[in-house]
């Protein structure tokens, strides 16, 4: 029987001689050279050589455990005289022993991380990880310990986990935002002689709301004419906030003052300015000066920083109203009206109203600005402001009509006002669905019955643009004797199927299939589209090879386009028969 133990070999051997591995030996070996030892398997004859007389195995090259930790070989002992084995072929293992020849390598060269400013000491920032290719099961070659080389006293690292934490209280983003931390990973448990690698961690302090808004001045003054309609901006005020993003967002509000109900303040989200606007119509004759108290506050407050003081500031705004000779004022800034697209001419849509705000209360007359209604689709009663249609509408041509109405003082035509009217045309189901494209397809002469030759899709100009419920069927006049059937897929598509086995292009080269498409809207709309099916010779894969060469010529005025509706005309049958076209009607 064989006599050996498992073989072990140290990696990265640097000696000048071959490295001795071990000895294969059979107890049948009497030492007289009658046995021959043969080695096969992983690296045999190349990495590992054997003295065929003695069974001594040597490694010819330097081995790397990280590349291959185990070699599996087979041993044979052969009687030289008979050529027969004296032992059964046996498998043995050479195990490569680890040395510390690999430094820890971080999973990233550079890590980026964020942590909120003012975070408590010990707040988790990021975890770095280094891996060591050496053997973790033997010695400390792969035992990695983390330490911080750069970044103290701001941050610390847990030696075993690589978790980076904050180490300093009250780190303020407004003072310093970016930190570069260098972390070392060292093997051998961090002992002397261990190999090491480093990585850089770029840490950004993220903002928290630790700064209140502040007005740069305590008083603002603005002027506005009394004619300013509601919504008119009068002026802008701006508080500053050292924070960024949502922590620097500011909400403005009027907290006090005599103009509390006359003015509004809105926040410009882009600039974070407070825009003072007119809330109600002003009247110079009634009041000429308003004083408001405006407050700027942070909407996103962090309760733990409330001890720093209130996160708001206030300023005084003085508004002076200027006298104006005023034009008529409409009851609304804009009018939105709607009308069905099937409305008859002279249908009233709605009305506008304006009046002279001055003490004189001059009467007004109304008109449509014809530059905004060139086609004269709408008209207005000059006395009462009623808007009515003067032409038929079509939503599919134009959904919104934006026109301008003018109100003019009869006694003083220089004084006029304009108001936009947005007229929405409401949909009526007045369009039939149609084929989505022109369908011209082919059928193979050797086609089998119930074979799908074309999928049909439909479109409809009416609302809802993408939510129709279409149905498809052969036109009644074609359904009975047709060589094809329509299969409604119930998903707004349909398939054309063959109805018989085999077609003869010499008997009938082209079929015209009238397909009725309808919606399930109200009132139901339908159209008939024609699908042209050519009969073709095909290869055994069903690929078209040849169809009739003669062109498909239609009588003047007819086409096979989607949505065409064919009607019989005397004399047309002869034309279609001459072209071998089956006419479904």
């Amino acid at each position: 029987s064989w006599m050996w133990n498992q073989f072990f070999l140290l990696e990265e051997y640097t000696g000048s001689d071959y490295q001795y591995v071990g000895k294969l030996h059979s107890d049948q070996d009497r030492g007289d050279g009658s046995l021959k030892y043969i080695l096969s398997g992983d690296g045999a004859g190349d990495l590992f050589i054997i003295n065929e007389n003695t069974g001594d195995i040597q490694a010819t090259k330097r081995l790397d455990r990280e590349e291959k930790p185990v070699y599996i070989l087979r041993a044979q002992a052969i009687n030289r005289r008979t050529g027969r084995p004296v032992e059964p072929e046996s498998e043995f293992i050479i195990k490569i022993h680890d040395i510390n020849d690999n430094e820890p390598i971080f999973t990233k060269d550079v890590y980026t991380a964020t942590v909120p400013e003012m975070a408590d000491v010990g707040t988790f920032v990021v975890q770095v990880t280094a891996t060591d290719a050496d053997d973790p099961t033997y010695g400390n070659s792969a035992k990695v310990v983390y330490s911080i080389l750069q970044g103290q006293p701001y941050f610390s690292v847990e030696s075993e986990t690589g978790i980076i934490k904050t180490a300093l209280l009250n780190m303020d983003r407004e003072n310093r935002e970016q930190y570069q931390v260098v972390i070392q990973a060292k093997d051998m448990g961090g002992q002397m002689g261990g190999l090491s690698g480093t990585t850089t961690v770029n840490i950004t302090l993220t903002d928290v709301n630790d700064n209140p808004p502040r007005f740069p001045q305590s008083t603002y003054q603005f002027k506005t004419p009394e004619s300013s309609p509601p919504g008119t901006p009068i002026g802008r005020i701006k508080a500053s906030d050292a924070d960024v993003g949502e922590n620097a967002e500011i909400e403005y509000s009027i907290t006090d003052g005599e103009g509390h109900d006359m003015f509004d303040v809105i926040t410009d989200q882009e600039t974070q300015e407070g825009i003072i606007t007119v809330k109600k119509l002003l009247d110079f004759e009634k009041k000429r000066v308003y004083t408001l108290k405006v407050e700027a506050s942070n909407p996103h407050i962090e309760p733990r920083f409330l001890y720093l003081g209130p996160f708001k500031d206030s300023a005084t705004v003085r508004i002076v109203v200027d006298d104006v000779d005023e034009p008529p004022v409409f009851s609304k800034l804009a009018y939105i009206l709607q009308i069905r697209e099937d409305a008859q001419i002279n249908t009233t849509i709605g009305s506008v109203a304006a009046q002279d705000p001055d003490a004189a209360r001059n009467p007004v007359k109304y008109s449509v600005d014809r530059h905004t209604d060139m086609d004269r689709i709408f008209n207005i009663d000059s006395g009462n402001g009623s808007i009515f249609t003067s032409k038929l509408l079509d939503r599919e041509t134009l959904l919104w009509h934006n026109i301008t109405v003018i109100a003019t003082e009869i006694n003083n035509p220089k004084q006029s006002s304009r108001v936009p009217l947005y007229i929405k045309v409401l949909d009526v189901n007045d369009n039939a669905p149609e084929f989505a494209e022109f369908y011209e397809t082919f059928v193979c002469e050797k086609a089998k019955a119930d074979q799908l030759i074309q999928t049909l899709h439909a479109v409809d100009k009416d609302d809802p643009y993408s939510g129709h419920q279409f149905s498809f069927s052969l036109a009644p006049e074609a359904a009975s004797g047709s060589n094809f059937t329509i299969q409604d897929n119930k998903d707004n598509t349909a398939g054309i199927l063959t109805r018989k086995n085999g077609y003869n292009r010499h008997e009938m080269s082209t079929y015209l299939l009238p397909v009725v498409i309808s919606d399930n809207d109200y009132p139901v709309q339908s159209s008939t589209g024609t699908v042209t099916v050519r009969v073709c010779a095909c290869d055994h894969h069903g690929n078209m090879q040849s169809c009739h060469a003669e062109a498909l010529i239609h009588p003047t005025g007819l086409s096979t386009g989607a949505g065409s509706e064919f009607r019989h005309d005397s004399g047309l049958n002869d034309i279609f028969e001459a072209q071998k076209i089956e006419w479904h009607e």
Epitope: R340, L426, D427, V428, N429, D463, P464, S466, G467, H468, Q469, S471, S473, A475, P476, A479, D488, V516, S518, D519, N520, D521, Y522, P523, V524, S526
Partner: antibody, heavy 116, light 107 residues
Framework: QVQLLESGGGLVQPGGSLRLSCAAS????????MSWVRQAPGKGLEWVSV????????YYADSVKGRFTISRDNSKNTLYLQMNSLRAEDTAVYYC?????????WGQGTLVTVSS | DIQMTQSPSSLSASVGDRVTITCRAS??????LNWYQQKPGKAPKLLIY???TLQSGVPSRFSGSGSGTDFTLTISSLQPEDFATYYC?????????FGQGTKVEIK
């Protein structure tokens, strides 16, 4: 799966009012025209009203025109029928149904009885 | 309004029978005709639309044919669950109208 559930039926005196609701689920409600169909006890079916998907257009049978109003709230997936000036001949089971021409899904119906 | 007339008003048949119900419109309605089935105390159920298109989930023993003014609903082999009242409905022009119904009873 598609479900339509009517509610709001009951006993009402002639001249009174009632509002029926139909809660829809299992399909994109805002893409479909919706209808009301009624059936008097022991009688056949009668189309009552239809509203288009956007609510922009409504249509009524002559027998209810001026008294009934169909409406919908696409945000709530709900169809309504406001019935005013009710008459004895309005007594029926009222069904809501999906579609404007063919009605491929129906609710279970709600009974409206108009009687003094 | 378009009048829809169904015939017969009622019929008796046995399981396995071939049953035919006809519906006649007072004017041409092309192919815009639907068939519904209604069982007592239940809502109607759509069987066929556009004269001949079978609604999803409806057994293939039901079929529809016809165009213009004359239409037919055929049940090729009557099953126990098919005993019900059947209505035709036109949707060619408003107002949409139903036939008076055909009651299919067990013989």
């Amino acid at each position: 799966q598609v479900q339509l559930l009517e509610s709001g039926g009951g006993l009402v005196q002639p001249g009174g009012s009632l509002r029926l609701s139909c809660a829809a689920s299992g399909f994109t409600f805002s893409s479909y025209a919706m209808s009301w169909v009624r059936q008097a006890p022991g009688k056949g079916l009668e189309w009552v009203s239809v509203i288009r998907s956007s609510g922009s257009s409504t249509y009524y049978a002559d027998s209810v025109k001026g008294r009934f109003t169909i409406s919908r709230d696409n945000s709530k997936n709900t169809l309504y029928l406001q019935m005013n000036s009710l008459r004895a001949e309005d007594t029926a089971v009222y069904y809501c149904a999906r579609g404007g021409g063919y009605f491929d899904y129906w609710g279970q119906g709600t009974l409206v009885t108009v009687s003094s | 309004d378009i009048q829809m007339t169904q015939s017969p008003s009622s019929l008796s048949a046995s399981v396995g029978d071939r049953v035919t119900i006809t519906c006649r419109a007072s004017q041409s309605i092309s192919l815009w005709l639907n068939w519904y089935q209604q069982k007592p105390g239940k809502a109607p159920k759509l069987l066929i639309y556009a004269a001949s298109t079978l609604q999803s989930g409806v057994p293939s023993r039901f079929s529809g044919s016809g165009s213009g003014t004359d239409f037919t609903l055929t049940i090729s082999s009557l099953q126990p669950e098919d005993f019900a009242t059947y209505y035709c409905q036109q949707y060619y022009t408003s107002p949409y109208t139903f036939g008076q119904g055909t009651k299919v009873e067990i013989k």
